[in-house]
């Protein structure tokens, strides 16, 4: 099995955006990688971004993606931007060794990302 | 809800082909693997085959590869399989199945049967 | 290739009775990849447990997981009629994914 550390507990800044490294224990020489967060609330699991890459190559999302990343070697630096307060959660971090075979998964424990709106700023007179 | 329902099952003269076509519903099609798994008569659960998210990477069983292949389109929310040259001992229900998020196979097909006979 | 092997291959048994069935693998496998599945007579199989103790989607709480390493074990606390079946283990950490050979679970 392959093993997926990533940390307990991130904060969100004010601008909500938050960051955590993804790292894994490759059991074989990978080429191709899926990385996947999952966001998990009560039972529910929910995709929030994925991106494949290659061993050496940018990881790249989907434009429209709230996630960004950088890959080097078996760590991957993921941010995700635009949260709120409401989607404080368990994120969880799914790698997959695609190419070539055999084919592995590992599921890290998950960060408590927590996300705190900003106050709106007090008119002033 | 989560539906997947398997069709193109039949009977088939060895060394024919078949193809076997699972639709489904309810949910991101392209965001999970999808596989194949065999029943024979009476017999236990057989994996065949897995196809990820984009379609370029497929898994097979040692049983059938060179000889089923895998595929899916996105567009249309199914999974297809290919069978060639095809074998009694290929006979069995097959089931498309869904790869959960966490790996299990969280949602079946009804089951599709597939007699291969003279 | 990660071998399942399950045991007993049938358990006689009375509803209201406790069930447990062992899924021993060939290696050790991570516990996160550890499923449980029921198949009723001419139905599909159902996902129960899956990370070899995690409850699937509206499945009772009579059904559990438990273990580690090689040797998994599914408890049914108290067998209702609609629960005697056939039970098969699977490992997904790892291509091919396997499937022990089936515990059938009858009426005694």
């Known amino acids: 099995a392959m093993h997926v550390a990533q940390p307990a507990v991130v904060l969100a800044n004010s601008r909500g955006t938050a960051s955590f490294v993804c790292e894994y224990a490759s059991p074989g020489k990978a080429t191709e990688v899926r990385v996947t967060v999952l966001r998990q609330a009560d039972s529910q699991v929910t995709e929030v971004c994925a991106a494949t890459y290659m061993m050496g190559n940018e990881l790249t999302f989907l434009d429209d993606s709230i996630c960004t990343g950088t890959s080097s070697g078996n760590q991957v630096n993921l941010t995700i931007q635009g949260l709120r307060a409401m989607d404080t959660g368990l994120y969880i971090c799914k790698v997959e060794l695609m190419y070539p075979p055999p084919y592995y998964m590992g599921i890290g424990n998950g960060t408590q990302i927590y996300v705190i709106d900003p106050e709106p700023c007090p008119d002033s007179d | 809800q989560v539906q997947l329902v398997e069709s193109g099952g039949g009977v088939v003269q060895p060394g024919r082909s078949l193809r076997l076509s699972c639709v489904a519903s309810g949910f991101t099609f392209s965001s999970h693997g999808m596989h194949w798994v065999r029943q024979a008569p009476g017999k236990g659960l057989e994996w065949v085959a897995v196809i990820w998210y984009d379609g370029r990477n497929k898994y097979y069983a040692d049983s059938v590869k060179g000889r089923f292949t895998i595929s899916r389109d996105n567009s249309k929310n199914t999974l297809f399989l290919q069978m060639n040259s095809l074998r009694a001992e290929d006979t069995a229900v097959y089931y498309c199945?869904?790869?959960?998020?966490?790996?299990?196979?969280?949602?079946w097909g009804q089951g599709t049967l597939v007699t291969v006979s003279s | 290739e990660i071998v399942l092997t399950q045991s007993p291959g049938t358990l006689s048994l009375s509803p209201g009775e406790r069930a447990t069935l062992s899924c021993r693998a060939s290696?050790?496998?991570?516990?996160?990849?550890l499923a449980w599945y029921q198949q009723r007579p001419g139905q599909a199989p159902r996902l129960l447990i899956y990370g070899a103790s995690s409850r699937a989607t509206g499945i009772p709480d009579r059904f559990s997981g438990s273990g580690s390493g090689t040797d998994f074990t599914l408890t049914i606390s108290r067998l209702e009629p609609e629960d005697f079946a056939v039970y098969y283990c699977q490992q997904y950490g790892t291509s091919p994914w396997t499937f022990g050979q089936g515990t059938k679970v009858e009426i005694k």
């Open positions: 199945a869904r790869g959960g998020h966490f790996g299990p196979f969280d949602y």
């Open positions: 290696q050790s496998i991570s516990s996160s990849f």
